[in-house]
């Protein structure tokens, strides 16, 4: 990029540059119209018969350098060929010299600085590539010379450019003073400011464009070369912040449109909002969940919104004494999540009717909550109690929802408690045809034993027809009509208000072979 400091082609007023010395044959300003009919200024000099050592100087106005360290001067000029000038003497030249002088203000006068090399700094002696020939009475013909010179390094606030003629017949058609700078550049979402190079290459720190953030790694920088060109593109750069995506060739970040989002900084474009979410504003990093839908704390910001599951279905109970096996089916609606678990709430009601949360004597296997399989075994149920179990399905967002958690209830009433099995049967007397039995009274938890039932049969006779029963209100019984010298198997059970208890273990007894043995007590 070139920044113009002076362009005589664009000057609308007289240039009025300073000449030295004030003699005839000096540089003179002329005006004309360019191809677009714009006013242009030129300078001419043609003192080809000058005295030896006589120089004609022309100095521009003071030019502020505007931070430039090296300034370029493009000269357009024509030069008459000495041979085509009839009056030209030996002092005729086809070159001129360019100088500059630096100062911190417009302090030069008609006489100062001294019109000589040092204080003026010589830039170059310029020779014409193309000479213009002039024949008497004819128009001069020849090409325009274009020469670009480099001034510097410059350090003061401004400078003057000066032209020294020592016998040329020439016209300085235009002067363009400019410096080169690296134009503002936006690349990889990084903005590098317009930079005037002060050296061969200058490192320039970049800054992220609006709504971009630095990418990991070293902060982005680029090198501005002396020729006003940026060196190769930066490796690292910036990336669009959450809610923004790269646009316009990676030069700016554009806010995600309504209904889209971008959760992280970095590459990638805005995505449509995931299921059950929406974004009502532009520039969303996250989409808001619809009413009744949530994201768990551990869910990624780009995850769909989910809802708690519905209640489990079809709870089936199997009561086995003080144990209960419950199983159920998965809920119809999982809420869109995989992390489904189950939990149970329990209430118990005594026979008298008072109810309370279940006590600590119940055990749940595998547990009362965080169940991943749809079943549980409850142990330690009390007899004659009514239990209500509420089975709930839960997932990762259940804790975020307000309102009641849906559940599937099941009621189970345990049986009242029957007496325990009767054991310790003793034979108190035996005869060839009878056996007298006695046993300890079992401790019945729910009321006293009302009576007993004795079940017996001859050993080896297993059929139902061979089994006989005997009821007794005492804890003893006499079995009659038995076979002589036969073995019998006897079992006893007790009955309370709750019903019969289980039969106890089979007791083995034997009748006498003959009467002579008489009655005798036998221990069980």
């Amino acid at each position: 990029l070139e920044e113009t400091l002076l362009n005589t082609k664009l000057e609308t007023a007289d240039l009025k540059w300073v000449t030295f010395p004030q003699v005839d044959g000096q540089w003179e300003e002329l005006s004309g119209l360019d191809e677009e009919q714009h006013s242009v200024r030129t300078y001419e000099v043609c003192d080809v018969q000058r005295a030896p050592g006589q120089a004609h100087w022309l100095r521009t106005g003071w030019v502020p350098r505007r931070g430039a360290v090296h300034v370029y001067a493009t000269l357009r000029f024509t030069m008459l060929e000495c041979l085509s000038l009839p009056r030209a003497g030996r002092s005729c030249k086809e070159t001129f010299t360019v100088f500059y002088y630096e100062s911190d203000a417009d302090t030069a006068t008609a006489l100062t600085p001294a019109w000589m090399e040092n204080p003026y700094i010589k830039v170059d002696t310029v020779a014409a590539e193309h000479l213009t020939r002039k024949r008497p009475g004819a128009e001069a013909t020849g090409k325009v010379n274009v020469k670009t010179l480099r001034l510097g390094p410059l350090s003061k606030a401004g400078f003057y450019l000066a032209f020294q003629d020592q016998g040329a017949c020439m016209a300085l058609l235009s002067l363009h003073l400019f410096y080169k700078k690296c134009a503002q550049l936006t690349v990889n979402l990084t903005r590098f400011p317009e930079t005037v190079p002060r050296e061969l290459v200058v490192p320039v720190a970049g800054s992220c464009v609006v709504d971009a953030v630095p990418a990991p790694g070293p902060s982005p920088s680029l090198y501005c070369r002396e020729d006003g060109q940026w060196a190769e593109q930066p490796v690292t750069g910036c990336s669009c912040a959450p809610g923004f995506e790269a646009a316009e060739g990676n030069t700016k970040c554009r806010a995600c449109a309504q209904g889209t989002f971008k959760p992280l900084s970095g590459e990638g474009s805005c995505q449509p909002c995931p299921a059950n979410s929406h974004s009502n504003t532009i520039g969303s990093a996250v989409c808001q969940c619809r009413v009744g839908y949530f994201r768990a704390r551990t869910d990624p910001r780009g995850a769909p919104c989910t809802t708690p599951p519905s209640a489990p279905r079809s709870v089936v109970s199997r009561l086995n004494g003080s144990s209960l096996h419950l199983e159920w089916s998965a809920p119809l609606e999982s809420g869109g999540r995989e992390d489904l678990t189950y939990a149970l709430r329990c209430r118990e009601c005594r026979p008298g009717g008072s109810c309370a949360p279940c006590g600590g004597d119940l055990t749940f296997d595998p547990g009362p909550r965080d169940l991943v399989e749809p079943w549980v075994v409850v142990r330690g149920l009390r007899p004659d109690f009514t239990y209500t179990f509420e089975v709930t399905a839960l997932n990762g967002v259940s804790s975020l929802a307000t309102g009641p958690v849906p559940f599937e209830p099941v009621n189970v009433t345990t049986d009242r408690e029957v007496p325990p099995a009767v054991s310790d049967i003793r034979v108190t007397r035996s005869s060839p045809s009878s056996l007298s039995l006695a046993w300890a009274v079992p401790r019945a938890p729910s009321g006293a034993v009302l009576d007993y039932e004795v079940k017996y049969h001859e050993k080896g006779a297993e059929g139902p027809s061979s089994v006989r029963f005997l009821k007794t209100s005492e804890n003893r019984a006499e079995l009659r009509g038995l076979k002589r010298g036969a073995s019998y198997l006897v079992q006893v059970r007790a009955r309370s208000e709750a019903g019969y208890g289980p039969f106890g273990q089979e007791h083995h007894s034997q009748t006498q072979l003959d009467e002579s043995e008489g009655w005798r007590e036998q221990l069980a």
Partner: antibody, heavy 128, light 108 residues
Framework: QVQLVESGGGLVQPGGSLRLSCAAS????????MSWVRQAPGKGLEWVSL??????????SYAAGVKGRFTISRDNSKNTLYLQMNSLRAEDTAVYYC???????????????????WGQGTLVTVSS | DIELTQPPSVSVAPGQTARISCSGD??????VHWYQQKPGQAPVLVIY???KRPSGIPERFSGSNSGNTATLTISGTQAEDEADYYC???????????FGGGTKLTVL
Amino acid sequence: QVQLVESGGGLVQPGGSLRLSCAASGFTFNNAWMSWVRQAPGKGLEWVSLIEAKEANGATSYAAGVKGRFTISRDNSKNTLYLQMNSLRAEDTAVYYCARKGMSFYNNKYAKSMFDLWGQGTLVTVSS
Amino acid sequence: DIELTQPPSVSVAPGQTARISCSGDNLGKKYVHWYQQKPGQAPVLVIYYDSKRPSGIPERFSGSNSGNTATLTISGTQAEDEADYYCSAWTTTMMHIVFGGGTKLTVL
């Protein structure tokens, strides 16, 4: 020798026309930028019109008071400058001078900004 | 466009210095030329480019231009210098020329 000689002046009625001529000699006419300057009786100089050299496209310009009524032209083969004056008014009464702008050494696309050569003038009287 | 203002008349004793002014907005940024016109004659260029003197013009004629004022100075004025003097400049359009109203120099 180097000189300019005007002719064609005279008495003309308002609304009438007149053509002034300026014969140049002693210099390369087609390289010169030429102009007309007038001077009303007892008044100052007033620039009227300008024509560039041939190589500079022969562009013309006029003072506001005469634009559209006067036309400047040149015939380089005759080394002559013209001013065609139409719709003349009483206020156009003046001595009309032909003047040459300072010439470039060799590039007639450009000229110096002063008039370095003047003719003796020709009187134009517009009266009924 | 620029307007050039001159005093209508200036008087000077022979041998003294005469100064004729020409003023206009930022005139110092433009080149000013001076013309001498004697009665019944065509104008003659006496100073151009603010301070340059054409060949044949006596050294007593000089010019300067800065700020808003250009000045024609005649040192050691002579009777033959009695004439009307006009300043002139190009306008910014470059194709238009403006003259001052003229100053009558009387040599007493």
